[in-house]
């Protein structure tokens, strides 16, 4: 349904508060270096303009597209060339090329200072002094650091952020109330950002078909009682929502997400029995709840899959008539029967099935050719099962920190060209799979673990894409979305790598390490471990363990010393010498 003024339409649909918040997120995600005050000014100007269009949709410029309006506004920023360099060239382009240009310049790893959390009293004062500015600043800081954050979900985070301050700034022990809530929001926010980044990468790098396949599999697992036609409708709508958000069309995205939540709740009887509680919540909570809802129970008496997809003489006829629909039905039927499989495994099975049909439907005896296709699935299913079993055993044996270290060594040996901060970040996140998933029973382990690993490996892929240094990473990241994890798992030690020159400065530590949090201290040690492996890629586990144990003892000793700095200087030299000797450097 065409509207005379798109900006007026979205303003009316979303309301002023959400409109302003979403425009701020959009601008901060595009111009990640701009100061907060500049963005607020731009948002206010756009909002005032939108109000004139609501009053009179025929007013000047009200008929322009949102991309045109927002792009024109962004291009008024005076310091565009100095701050963003070649991104300023986007402004010479016309829509839709201009928006595409802005999208291409989104930076997954912007050079921004780490967000330091002020004292609780300072935060509470700021919250009370100007609640609106305080919350806008939250949106701005998150959006600029996470340029693909799912905007309607960020509104939900902001609502929880506000609720935390409203409650805790009145509490007797403000810190005890607030800090755990902020930690939870931070951790959930990082996870949400990473999950959405994978969706956008899927759409942008592998196309709509890849995203739709993912959505069919996931929604079929979640809503196994829903008919295929219903799942297909939800997939189409969900694809539109994520395409919009990943494309920077945040107003349309938020509006369509709300419509989708409304539709799901109006039709929950034919979708899932688990939606009742979600559908009683307000909009933002409702949408979040639906996105996280547990899988419904599988219908009783589901027939054999083989009947329609292997034994039937009509397989090739059905496939030829509508390939994607037939493959979609296969994926739907397989996924609804297998909540115990990861989505990526289901997609691998569907790909194997498709490849078999492509080959067999051209053969002299198609049925004879594809009769054993399900046998080909067995090794594909067993590979992640075995990998998860082995790694959960290792995790239970080592604990999270040492499990992360094992992964750090493993991945540094696979792709030593990758920057140390990236290897540390990715390996730490890979290691979190243990505490996240190994506690689950067998039936939930694979969907938890492998789909989580897909999210983490996508972080590696997007960070590496910005500054490509390893052909092996590029290959695993670009060849197949669903085979990324098996591709990385299959990598052995990179024999072509020339060890990094030894630099004593890398292994020089100071007393400041003693005041760091446990997490920060771990990161320091893990950074040193990666550097060790880069210097000595052929070092054995035992050698590395010995050096790391010595290093931990050194830090502990010097942090207890009266003259910490002297201890770090003197004992540090001894440690470096001993480590060089131990590793034969």
């Amino acid at each position: 349904d065409a509207h005379k003024s798109e900006v007026a339409h979205r303003f009316k649909d979303l309301g002023e508060e959400n409109f302003k918040a979403l425009v701020l997120i959009a601008f901060a995600q595009y111009l990640q270096q701009c100061p907060f005050e500049d963005h607020v000014k731009l948002v206010n100007e756009v909002t005032e303009f939108a109000k004139t269009c609501v009053a009179d949709e025929s007013a000047e410029n009200c008929d322009k597209s949102l991309h045109t309006l927002f792009g024109d506004k962004l291009c008024t920023v005076a310091t565009l060339r100095e701050t963003y360099g070649e991104m300023a060239d986007c402004c010479a382009k016309q829509e839709p090329e201009r928006n595409e240009c802005f999208l291409q310049h989104k930076d997954d790893n912007p050079n921004l200072p780490r967000l330091v959390r002020p004292e609780v009293d300072v935060m509470c004062t700021a919250f009370h002094d100007n609640e609106e500015t305080f919350l806008k600043k939250y949106l701005y800081e998150i959006a600029r650091r996470h340029p693909y954050f799912y905007a309607p979900e960020l509104l939900f985070f902001a609502k929880r952020y506000k609720a935390a301050f409203t409650e805790c700034c009145q509490a007797a022990d403000k810190a005890a109330c607030l800090l755990p809530k902020l930690d939870e929001l931070r951790d959930e926010g990082k996870a949400s950002s990473a999950k959405q980044r994978l969706k956008c990468a899927s759409l942008q790098k592998f196309g709509e078909r890849a995203f739709k396949a993912w959505a069919v599999a996931r929604l079929s697992q979640r809503f196994p009682k829903a008919e295929f036609a219903e799942v297909s409708k939800l997939v189409t709508d969900l694809t539109k929502v994520h395409t919009e958000c990943c494309h920077g069309d945040l107003l349309e995205c938020a509006d369509d997400r709300a419509d989708l939540a409304k539709y799901i709740c109006e039709n929950q009887d034919s979708i899932s029995s688990k939606l009742k509680e979600c559908c009683e919540k307000p909009l933002l909570e409702k949408s979040h709840c639906i996105a996280e809802v547990e899988n419904d129970e599988m219908p009783a008496d589901l027939p054999s899959l083989a009947a329609d997809f292997v034994e039937s003489k009509d397989v090739c006829k059905n496939y030829a008539e509508a390939k994607d629909v037939f493959l979609g039905m296969f994926l739907y039927e397989y996924a609804r029967r297998h909540p115990d499989y990861s989505v990526v495994l289901l997609l691998r099975l569907a790909k194997t099935y498709e490849t078999t049909l492509e080959k067999c439907c051209a053969a002299a005896d198609p049925h004879e050719c594809y009769a054993k296709v399900f046998d080909e699935f067995k090794p594909l299913v067993e590979e992640p099962q075995n990998l998860i079993k082995q790694n959960c055993e290792l995790f239970e044996q080592l604990g999270e920190y040492k499990f992360q270290n094992a992964l750090l060594v493993r991945y540094t040996k696979k792709v030593p060209q990758v920057s140390t901060p990236t290897l540390v970040e990715v390996s730490r996140n890979l290691g979190k799979v243990g505490s996240k998933c190994c506690k689950h029973p067998e039936a939930k382990r694979m969907p938890c673990a492998e789909d989580y690993l897909s999210v983490v490996l996508n972080q590696l892929c997007v960070l590496h894409e910005k500054t490509p240094v390893s052909d092996r990473v590029t290959k695993c990241c670009t060849e197949s979305l669903v085979n990324r994890r098996p591709c990385f798992s299959a990598l052995e030690v990179d024999e072509t790598y020339v060890p990094k020159e030894f630099n004593a400065e890398t292994f020089t530590f100071h007393a400041d390490i003693c005041t760091l949090s446990e997490k920060e201290r771990q990161i320091k040690k893990q950074t040193a471990l990666v550097e060790l492996v880069k210097h000595k890629p052929k070092a054995t586990k035992e050698q590395l363990k010995a050096v790391m144990d010595d290093f931990a003892a050194f830090v502990e000793k010097c942090c207890k010393a009266d003259d910490k700095e002297t201890c770090f200087a003197e004992e540090g030299k001894k440690l470096v010498a001993a480590s060089q000797a131990a590793l034969g450097l």
């Epitope: 027939p303 009947a307 329609d308 039937s312 009509d314």
Partner: antibody, heavy 121, light 111 residues
Framework: EVQLVESGGGLVQPGGSLRLSCAAS????????MGWVRQAPGKGLEYIGI???????YYASWAKGRFTISRDNSKNTVYLQMNSLRAEDTATYFC???????????????WGQGTLVTVSS | DIQMTQSPSSLSASVGDRVTITCQSS????????LSWYQQKPGQPPKLLIY???DLASGVPSRFSGSGSGTDFTLTISSLQPEDFATYYC???????????FGGGTKLTVK
């Protein structure tokens, strides 16, 4: 007792619609393809179409577009929706259980008693 | 459309006779053997006798047998019994489930 029972037949005017039901008892419909076959008074058997266990439908060329087969496994029932009915559609309509699950083998080993549909003004 | 031709269309025989009915399809049936035979008595639904050209359906007496392949098939009743007087139909399954077809029928009556 394992059986199929058709219902929904009766007198209908030309151009009208009718939905026939076939309820299964004593077994689950989800394990076999279910077909519909008709027999005009004093004539032979005529295949209409079939629905597979997974819901794939296949129709005789003459039935395509006017007739629709569906199933509701939770109700253990198969349906035949008939539109734009003509006098020549007057027949006893049988539902039948195929030996196969995913296609029509032509071997229907369990039949209902049939329901008579009369198309007349 | 695929045609199934049964012959004869009617046949008179006596108890104890050996009876043969043939069925010819205009195209080869699926896997060369996807052919069934049915018996129907007035006011009753059809009853499956033979499937896959020669396999006897459950509960069917062994005097009934089927043979043939491709396009030509035969139903044989080795020794006719009083309860065998009925109409017999063949049905073929083809490479598409849409093409399943019945023969015109053979009415077997008492001579």
């Amino acid at each position: 007792e394992v059986q199929l029972v058709e219902s929904g037949g009766g007198l209908v005017q030309p151009g009208g619609s009718l939905r026939l039901s076939c309820a299964a008892s004593g077994f689950s419909l989800s394990s076999n393809a279910m077909g519909w076959v008709r027999q005009a008074p004093g004539k032979g058997l005529e295949y209409i179409g079939i629905i597979s266990v997974g819901g794939f439908t296949y129709y005789a060329s003459w039935a395509k577009g006017r007739f629709t087969i569906s199933r509701d496994n939770s109700k253990n029932t198969v349906y035949l929706q008939m539109n734009s009915l003509r006098a020549e559609d007057t027949a006893t309509y049988f539902c039948a259980r195929d030996r196969h699950g995913g296609d029509s083998s032509g071997a229907f080993y369990l039949w209902g008693q049939g329901t008579l549909v009369t198309v007349s003004s | 459309d695929i045609q199934m031709t049964q012959s004869p269309s009617s046949l008179s025989a006596s108890v104890g006779d050996r009876v043969t009915i043939t069925c010819q399809s205009s195209e080869s049936v699926y896997s060369n053997n996807q052919l069934s035979w049915y018996q129907q008595k007035p006011g009753q639904p059809p009853k499956l006798l033979i499937y896959d050209a020669s396999d006897l359906a459950s509960g069917v007496p062994s005097r009934f047998s089927g043979s043939g392949s491709g396009t030509d098939f035969t139903l044989t009743i080795s020794s006719l019994q009083p309860e065998d007087f009925a109409t017999y139909y063949c049905a073929g399954g083809f490479s598409s489930s849409s093409d399943t077809a019945f023969g015109g029928g053979t009415k077997l009556t008492v001579k």
